[in-house]
């Protein structure tokens, strides 16, 4: 089984644009990293800009779910 832990200080730069870094701890596989991106960014390392249209759509969906 695997679980997520927050990255150590020295690993945080795996993600860019202020993305929050998590390490996937898995006993049977090497460690790998995931990023939770800031609003406006996407991609494996938060390098991609989300088009404004999509951002607005996401906000609308978020409000609807609330």
């Amino acid at each position: 089984t695997s679980h997520l832990v927050k990255c150590a200080e020295k690993e945080k730069t795996f993600c860019v644009n202020g993305g929050e870094c998590f390490m996937v701890k898995d006993l049977s596989n090497p460690s790998r990293y995931l990023c939770k991106c800031q609003p406006g960014f996407t991609g494996a390392r938060c390098t991609e800009n989300v088009p404004m249209k999509v951002q607005n759509q996401e906000k609308a969906e978020e409000l609807y779910q609330k």
């Epitope: 200080e9 020295k10 690993e11 945080k12 730069t13 795996f14 860019v16 644009n17 202020g18 790998r32 991609g43 494996a44 390392r45 390098t47 991609e48």
Partner: antibody
Framework: EVQLVESGGGLVQPGGSLRLSCAAS????????IHWVRQAPGKGLEWVAA????????NYADSVKGRFTISADTSKNTAYLQMNSLRAEDTAVYYC?????????WGQGTLVTVSS | DIQMTQSPSSLSASVGDRVTITCRAS??????LAWYQQKPGKAPKLLIY???SLESGVPSRFSGSGSGTDFTLTISSLQPEDFATYYC?????????FGQGTKVEIK
């Protein structure tokens, strides 16, 4: 042992094209982030482009956007930089580098000279 | 783009000296700051990343500090092999940008 070997540099006329290669070994290529950085003669370092081989996402410096294309072939563990519409100011040593938490491994560089 | 400004642009020092190089970012880069060493005709070599993390295999005389916009690279006791050019680089946001370099020369 991690190794990055660039090739494809040379002399080209303004407006011409070149394709640089970066052959990688010693690590999981598809799981990394590959960058190209250049250095004009006697000058500092300039970031050029990056690619995530796993999903093909790319990023470019404004100075090369629309002229340069970065790509990767995971079956060959090789990244490429296709350079079109070359200008005199593109003259530089071009390095490829891997990025885990910073640019940790670099190739030896390949010289591109744009001159008539 | 984030501008990176290094100082000094060059310095002369003797073996055994303590050397400090500073780097300032034009906007907040948190702790996403790396330092590289480059010798003539060679590729840059990573020394420090995430502002203060020492890259594997790099001697402990090298250290980094800072966060936000102001950063420092310190060489506690300069060795003959340390004479080189040093670059800072922000790796907080693309495009990644480098300082103009600091050349450390023999006095």
């Amino acid at each position: 042992e991690v190794q990055l070997v660039e090739s494809g540099g040379g002399l080209v006329q303004p407006g011409g094209s070149l394709r640089l290669s970066c052959a990688a070994s010693g690590f999981t290529f598809s799981g990394t982030w590959i960058h190209w950085v250049r250095q004009a003669p006697g000058k500092g370092l300039e970031w050029v482009a990056a690619i995530t081989p796993a999903d093909g996402s790319t990023n470019y410096a404004d100075s090369v956007k629309g002229r340069f294309t970065i790509s990767a072939d995971t079956s060959k563990n090789t990244a490429y930089l296709q350079m079109n519409s070359l200008r005199a100011e593109d003259t530089a040593v071009y390095y490829c580098a891997t990025y885990m938490f910073a640019m940790d491994y670099w190739g030896q560089g390949t010289l591109v000279t744009v001159s008539s | 783009d984030i501008q990176m400004t290094q100082s000094p642009s060059s310095l002369s020092a003797s073996v055994g000296d303590r050397v400090t190089i500073t780097c300032r970012a034009s906007q907040n880069v948190d702790r996403s700051l790396a330092w590289y060493q480059q010798k003539p005709g060679k590729a840059p070599k990573l020394l420090i990343y995430a502002a203060s993390s020492l890259e594997s295999g790099v001697p402990s005389r090298f250290s980094g500090s800072g966060s936000g916009t102001d950063f420092t690279l310190t060489i506690s006791s300069l060795q003959p092999e340390d004479f080189a050019t040093y670059y800072c680089q922000q790796h907080y946001t693309l495009p990644f940008t480098f300082g103009q370099g600091t050349k450390v020369e023999i006095k």
